[in-house]
């Protein structure tokens, strides 16, 4: 009866199970009745890095050095490529694709600390009572506006990226010494 | 197409001054953050100053504070840098960048030499 499964490194064609081919090698044909799964090495700058059957090797990644990419670790028969930046230039995801100056903190994020040549920027949450609503390289968060030192109230709150809007007093004392009676807006306090 | 073309370079004798400029096109000037950064012979790029986009806020480098000002004219699409009390480690070549800067789109530089 043939077989439905097949063990670990192995692979179901045609009723049987055939071996898979190593990493750093690719498939030429499969196996027979009569023969073992035909496997061929990578050619140069070409790799594989699983136990496979791919009729094609994949190219080795170019660390283009127009976009300031320079190889950190040559690929081999197994293994791809790693590409890295140039001094003083920062990769833009794990894979590094691209270089940049320095990353940027999103709204909601100030700089904790700028880039140097050998550490990206590292950004850090704004925390309660502070806001960040820019896309910056150097900027801090910074604090919330205190509306009462401007003898304003508080609006609407803030957020971590946005500032407090201050607004007049509704009702304010009356300077009269009235015994600390709140009185209207423009009622006894000079207002027009 | 980003670009950017520093100018404003040259020999100068310690103590003196210089202004850079970077004029800019193929983006929105003024909604970016714009830096300087520069690179002195065999050394890494150090970064000097930056502005953001309204011209309110800057960030100076410990080692120019207070010699250096950064300002843009956004009518002008144009980066400036005064650099006074110039000092022989100020010898580098300077870029103009802004945020994000990949490195396709870096200008040339120019070149700063401070040597009596």
């Known amino acids: 009866e043939p077989p439905t499964a097949c063990r670990e490194k192995q692979y179901l064609i045609n009723s049987q199970c055939c071996s898979l081919c190593q990493p750093g090698q690719k498939l030429v044909s499969d196996c027979t009745e009569f023969t073992e799964t035909e496997c061929l090495p990578c050619g140069e700058s070409e790799f594989l890095d699983t136990w496979n059957r791919e009729t094609r090797c994949h190219q080795h990644k170019y660390c283009d050095p127009n976009l300031g990419l320079r190889v950190q670790q040559k690929g081999t028969s197994e293994t791809d490529t790693i590409c890295t930046c140039e001094e003083g230039w920062h990769c833009t995801s794990e894979a590094c694709e691209s270089c940049v100056l320095h990353r940027s903190c999103s709204p909601g994020f100030g700089v904790k600390q700028i880039a140097t040549g050998v550490s990206d920027t590292i950004c850090e949450p704004c925390p309660v009572g502070f806001f960040s609503n820019v896309s910056s390289a150097f900027e801090k968060c910074h604090p919330w506006t205190s509306c009462e030192t401007k003898d304003l109230v508080v609006q609407q709150a803030g957020t971590n990226k946005t500032d407090v809007v201050c607004g007049p007093q509704d009702r304010l004392r009356d300077p009269g010494g009235g015994g600390g009676r709140l009185v209207p807006r423009g009622f006894g306090t000079g207002d027009p | 197409e980003v670009q950017l073309l520093e100018s404003g370079g040259g020999l100068v004798q310690p103590g003196g001054s210089l202004r850079l400029s970077c004029a800019a096109s193929?983006?929105?000037?003024?909604?970016?953050?714009m830096w300087w950064v520069r690179q002195a012979p065999g050394k890494g790029l150090e970064r000097v100053s930056a502005i953001n986009p309204q011209g309110t806020r800057t960030y100076y480098a410990d080692s120019v504070k207070g010699r250096f000002t950064i300002s843009r004219d956004n009518s002008k699409n144009t980066l400036y840098l005064q650099m006074n009390s110039l000092r022989a480690e100020d010898t580098a070549v300077y870029y103009c960048a802004k945020l994000p800067t990949y490195f396709s789109d870096r200008g040339q530089g120019t070149l700063v030499t401070v040597s009596s």
């Open positions: 193929g983006f929105t000037f003024r909604d970016y953050e």
